[in-house]
């Protein structure tokens, strides 16, 4: 799902307040709901009819430093006999997510949000078939 | 996939620099890669063998204000005949993502990252069957 553009008003103070310096805001350290955890079933990536692998990208100046990307293993889907059925499609499910980018120039450290496109897993889809004349 | 805890060092300046005030940092406005877009196939949520619906939550003090959650339509998966096959499972694919929370007390506005668990879509899984003795 796509993240809309950040509205100009999102970083502004209420109208009755003195304006803030252009370009930067105060970011509190710490993460709300930091201990919340995914409760996804184990091994769904290998048990799915549209199985996938994971690869990890690492960047120490990004939070989270580790971003995991899924890649569908097949073009088709796995049928009840464990064979690939090419009449069906394994399709990536993508999600726009935010990460925090750390930027430093000498002793000046600032942070900025960055939009990252993550492939979270794959699903098996019945393709719409068109015969070209 | 889960986001690890934010390391204490992530918000710190290099050792040779004077320490920053405890608890808050400078957040640059604007989003890196803001124009990047999901290029997911159209209507995969209805054409998947594990189809899903979307619901939208809205919060004006969060960026993005709109967070979309998927819910699997069925317990089982849809077979080639368009019927539900309960020997297979529609399983949610979840992703931990970050949002930006806006907090204001009077004219003081600050921001904090918040972890949100998003169900992005569903995949069809073949379960391993055990008979309990």
């Amino acid at each position: 799902r796509k993240i809309p553009k950040v509205g100009h008003t999102f970083f502004q103070k209420p109208e009755s307040c003195p304006p803030v310096p252009e370009g930067s805001m105060k970011l509190d350290t710490g993460i709300i709901n930091e201990n919340q955890r995914v409760s996804m079933s184990r091994n769904i990536e290998s048990r799915s009819t549209s199985p996938w692998n994971y690869t990890v990208t690492w960047d120490p100046n990004r939070y989270p430093s580790e971003v995991v990307q899924a890649q569908c293993k097949h073009l088709g889907c796995i049928n009840a006999q464990g064979k690939e059925d090419i009449s069906m499609n394994s399709v990536p499910i993508q999600q726009e997510t935010l990460v925090l980018r750390r930027k430093h120039q000498g002793c000046s450290v600032s942070f900025q949000l960055e939009k990252v496109l993550v492939t979270v897993g794959c699903t098996c889809v019945t393709p719409v078939v068109h015969h070209v004349q | 996939r889960k986001i690890p805890k934010v390391g204490h060092t992530f918000f710190q300046k290099p050792e040779s620099c004077p320490p920053v005030p405890e608890g808050s940092m400078k957040l640059d406005t604007g989003i890196i890669n803001e124009n990047q877009r999901v290029s997911m196939s159209r209507n995969i949520e209805s054409r998947s063998t594990s189809p899903w619906n979307y619901t939208v939550t809205w919060d004006p003090n969060r960026y993005p204000s709109e967070v979309v959650q998927a819910q699997c339509k069925h317990l089982g998966c849809i077979n080639a005949q368009g019927k539900e096959d309960i020997s297979m499972n529609s399983v949610p694919i979840q992703q931990e993502t970050l949002v930006l929370r806006r907090k204001h007390q009077g004219c003081s506005v600050s921001f904090q990252l918040e972890k949100v668990l998003v169900t992005v879509g569903c995949t069809c899984v073949t379960p391993v069957v055990h008979h309990v003795q």
Epitope: S41, R42 | L75, N89, V91, V125, P127, V129, H130
Partner: nanobody, 116 residues
Amino acid sequence: EVQLVESGGGSVQAGDSLRLSCAASGRANSINWFGWFRQTPGKEREFVAGIRWSDAYTEYANSVKGRFTISRDNAKNTVDLQMDSLKPEDTAVYYCVLDLSTVRYWGQGTQVTVSS
């Protein structure tokens, strides 16, 4: 290891009610859905009813819709099947099923007999 304890089966007259219960214990975390199947001699097991753990979404076989009601107790890891207006064709062994998405556990079954 996961344990499933089924209870509530028995013999009743047509039109009567019964309530089946199933309790899960052991490593029964990350529940996807919980439900019931049934089987009569010489036939395949058929799905009766299921309830998704996360949001209590329910599904029923057409043959029991409007007569059977499935419910869950998250705190106790139990699922109940309230069976009303029972018919002789509901006679079967009823199996509790606990589904953990990638693993599915079947109970040993409890007999329900409905006489006319």
